[in-house]
Interface confidence: low
């Protein structure tokens, strides 16, 4: 038998420095977690103790904090090189700055293979990107070889900016011939490393013949065997065992997100490359693990450039700003309310005596809210805090939509409610009531909107044929998160101001903020 240790990360999202327990900015260093300096300590410890170790990343290193805002991926290449990653799969966020924003800072600078079997380049890009990422890589590990085959969510064109010269194929269809090719090369130990979410990871384990282990990402899935060490609730045991269609037991793993855990999986193979056993658990990278001093010094050196972003206080909050996905993708969250209030405030234009304002409504995809802000840091809110909440560098735009389009949008908001998907809408100037006992497409039972042609604003039922002005992220205006109806049916679209700037201006204007959860979004069952 031959034993392999797989160390893995996914969805690190630019958390190069240690963070608080909820993956926002580190406030109390003695209770902070993660970060590349701490990760390196643990990885090196395991490398010294065990013979056959691979360090893998399942995508979405890009996007999430000021580090990416400023360094645009150069930081990812530098520190992943320093940690000596063995391979990485492309995630959807690796395309957030377009293909060039992937090629120049990361693909050309990485000293490790970057993988995806289901992304095919065409047109002028094909020669430009040739060899910079690969469908698979055969890695020597001790006296053996291990094949790593990559995959990326086929939803990436809807989630990021990969352009028109990359085709995202079905994962299973694309993976099978690459795995078959590895088999013909006498590679009998194969890891599928990719970024399509836990459901797809399990399907790959079930359907792709020859895959021995699946290391995934995208859905921020936390798996754990036994009592979990922090706040994350396990979605299943680690590893999660899938029985393949050809009768094999295939371990599937993921390691939550934000560099909080290091996935640790031990696999035992027989001489024919069959998995005999698999066990392990994610390792919580808490303060009991020291930060490596050389990596920490390098972080501090790179950090200098960020300080002019992070030191200036914009204003204060006296309440916790809940921007967690556990809240904002499931219910009204006060971070969503704050952002929507800022969006409306930024569009106050008293140009007509008949109207108190030309626009009263805001919608915001919950998936666009990427971090909470803890008020226990003296209440201080900085640009850096906001860059973690709104890392995508988008704009808040003004559109005109018919009421019927808005109704469709709110139905889409909850059409697959409960799966922590980003399309759940946060709102301003809107009161919505959902009945989740009804079938998808018929769950909005009440939708009232704040009047504009009034001296005292009040909520009136949405009229299907009326045209309304709405402030929303450019991501939604462009049909992101599946809001195709907005893109297809909008009557006017005016590009607006930078998202972080809108919120920072509002906070600076208000000086002290205390947004509440106030009943903008409600859930109900039964008759109305």
């Amino acid at each position: 038998a031959w034993e392999l240790t797989i160390l893995h990360t996914n969805d690190v999202h630019s958390r190069l420095e240690q963070t608080s327990e909820d993956s926002s900015k580190c406030v109390n260093a003695s209770r902070c977690m993660g970060g590349v300096a701490r990760l390196f300590t643990k990885v090196q410890q395991i490398r010294r103790a065990e013979p056959n170790v691979l360090l893998l990343d399942a995508g979405d290193q890009y996007q999430g904090t000021i580090w990416f805002t400023v360094y645009k991926g150069a930081e990812v290449a530098h520190f992943m090189n320093a940690l000596r990653y063995d391979a990485m799969a492309l995630g959807n966020h690796e395309f957030d700055n377009g293909v060039e924003g992937l090629i120049e800072p990361l693909l050309k600078e990485a000293k490790f293979p970057i993988l995806s079997a289901n992304i095919k380049a065409k047109g002028p890009l094909a020669s430009q990107i040739s060899g910079l990422y690969l469908p698979y890589k055969v890695l020597p590990v001790g006296d053996e070889v291990v094949g790593i085959v990559g995959y990326t969510s086929k939803e990436t064109p809807f989630l990021s900016n990969p352009g028109t010269n990359l085709v995202f194929e079905d994962e299973i269809t694309a993976l099978q011939p690459e795995v078959d090719k590895l088999k013909t090369l006498n590679v009998n130990k194969i890891i599928a490393l990719g970024h399509s979410g836990f459901e797809m990871d399990k399907l790959i384990a079930q359907k792709v013949r020859g895959v021995d282990v699946v290391v995934g990402g995208h859905s921020n899935t936390f798996l754990y065997t036994g009592n979990p060490p922090s706040k994350e609730v396990p979605a299943g045991k680690y590893p999660f065992i899938v029985t393949s269609d050809d009768g094999r037991k295939v371990p599937v793993v993921q390691a939550y997100a934000f560099g909080k855990y290091l996935g640790y999986l031990k696999i035992e193979f027989d001489e024919r490359g069959n998995v005999i056993s698999s066990h392990g658990n994610p390792i919580l990278l808490n303060s009991s693990i020291p930060e490596d001093p050389s990596i920490k010094a390098d972080i501090n050196k790179w950090r200098i450039k960020l300080d002019n972003y992070s030191t200036q206080e914009l204003g204060k909050t006296i309440v916790y700003l809940d921007g967690s996905s556990q809240s904002c993708r499931f219910r009204e969250c006060n971070m969503g309310n704050l952002i929507c209030d800022a969006m409306i405030n930024n569009n106050l234009r008293h140009t007509d005596e008949m109207f108190w304002n030309h626009v009263s409504m805001c919608i915001l995809n919950g998936g666009g809210i990427r971090s909470p802000i803890d008020e226990r840091n003296n209440g201080t809110i900085t640009w850096e805090n906001l860059a973690a909440v709104l890392p995508f560098g988008g704009t808040f735009d003004l559109v005109q939509l018919k009421g019927s389009t808005l109704k469709k949008a709110f139905e889409h908001s909850v059409h697959r409610y409960g799966q922590s998907t980003g399309e759940f809408l946060q709102v301003g100037g809107i009161h919505v009531v959902y009945d989740l006992s009804r079938k998808p497409g018929d769950r909005v039972v009440k939708l009232d909107v704040l009047c504009t042609k009034c001296r005292v604003p009040s909520y009136d039922p949405l009229k299907m044929d009326e045209v309304y002005k709405v402030i929303l992220p450019n991501f939604l205006a462009n049909g992101g998160d599946g809001f195709q109806m907005i893109k297809d049916e909008l009557l006017r679209h005016d590009s607006g101001d930078q998202d972080i700037n809108v919120v920072s201006t509002y906070i600076s204007k208000m000086k002290v903020i205390y947004p509440a959860v106030e009943g903008r979004i409600k859930f109900s069952t039964g008759s109305h």
């Epitope: 400023v70 360094y71 645009k72 150069a74 700055n97 377009g98 293909v99 060039e100 924003g101 120049e104 047109g123 002028p124 890009l125 900016n161 352009g163 028109t164 010269n165 450039k305 002019n308 704009t395 450019n474 991501f475 462009n478 590009s495 930078q498």
Partner: antibody, heavy 120, light 107 residues
């Protein structure tokens, strides 16, 4: 061979409007961000506006924000700059330039420019 | 906005000289910097992107270096066709901004 050909320049009175066009050939237009850059006679270069491949990301210089609108028609391989409320200080050669796959990328190919003169 | 300061604003040099032009950003821009050459009555021509990467077709006598705030364009051996105005430009963030230009004249 990449070619960018600007048109629509000319003499216009202050306060009036003008629409510049740029027709692209020799590359897959809808893969690239596009930009307008201007140069007043005898002066340096000034970026005016940029637009991503799918029009999802748009930026303007402060000096033209609210007056100029950039747009593109990928089906026609064309880039446009609608210039309203023109001022004397808008007098310049206007160049169309090809960016990269993302909007914040280097400008690679440039057209020969079209002269806009704002004068009464 | 990020200010780009080029120096010198003009220089005189002879054929065969090694010429260095510097560009300083008012804040860090990583390596998101390009250099352009412009001859009178002509459109600018891209020489270098990402601070040090040569555009295809540009001769290797041109080189770029630097990261963060300080950048350099070097022409290793000046030729008659190199007398022109050179501009740096940052593309780290909106608005994109250019340096004021450096005019390279014949001594």
């Amino acid at each position: 061979e990449v070619q960018l050909v600007e048109s629509g320049g000319g003499l216009v009175q202050p306060g009036r409007s003008l629409r510049l066009s740029c027709v692209a050939s020799g590359f897959t237009f809808d893969d690239y961000a596009m930009h307008w850059v201007r140069q007043a006679p005898g002066k340096g270069l000034e970026w005016v506006s940029g637009i991503s491949w799918n029009s999802g990301s748009i930026g303007y210089a402060d000096s033209v924000k609210g007056r100029f609108t950039i747009s593109r028609d990928n089906a026609k391989n064309s880039l446009y700059l609608q210039m309203n409320s023109l001022r004397a200080e808008d007098t310049a050669f206007y160049y169309c330039a090809q960016g990269g796959y993302a909007i914040l990328t280097a400008l690679e190919y440039w057209g020969q420019g079209t002269l806009v003169t704002v004068s009464s | 906005d990020i200010q780009m300061t080029q120096s010198p604003s003009s220089l005189s040099a002879s054929v065969g000289d090694r010429v260095t032009i510097t560009c300083r950003a008012s804040q860090g821009i990583s390596n998101y910097l390009a250099w352009f050459q412009q001859k009178p009555g002509k459109a600018p021509k891209s020489l270098i992107y990402a601070a040090s990467s040569l555009q295809s077709g540009v001769p290797s006598k041109f080189s770029g270096s630097g990261s963060g705030t300080d950048f350099t364009l070097t022409i290793s051996s000046l030729q008659p066709e190199d007398f022109a105005t050179y501009y740096c430009q940052q593309y780290n963030s909106y608005p994109l901004t250019f340096g004021g230009g450096t005019k390279v004249e014949i001594k």
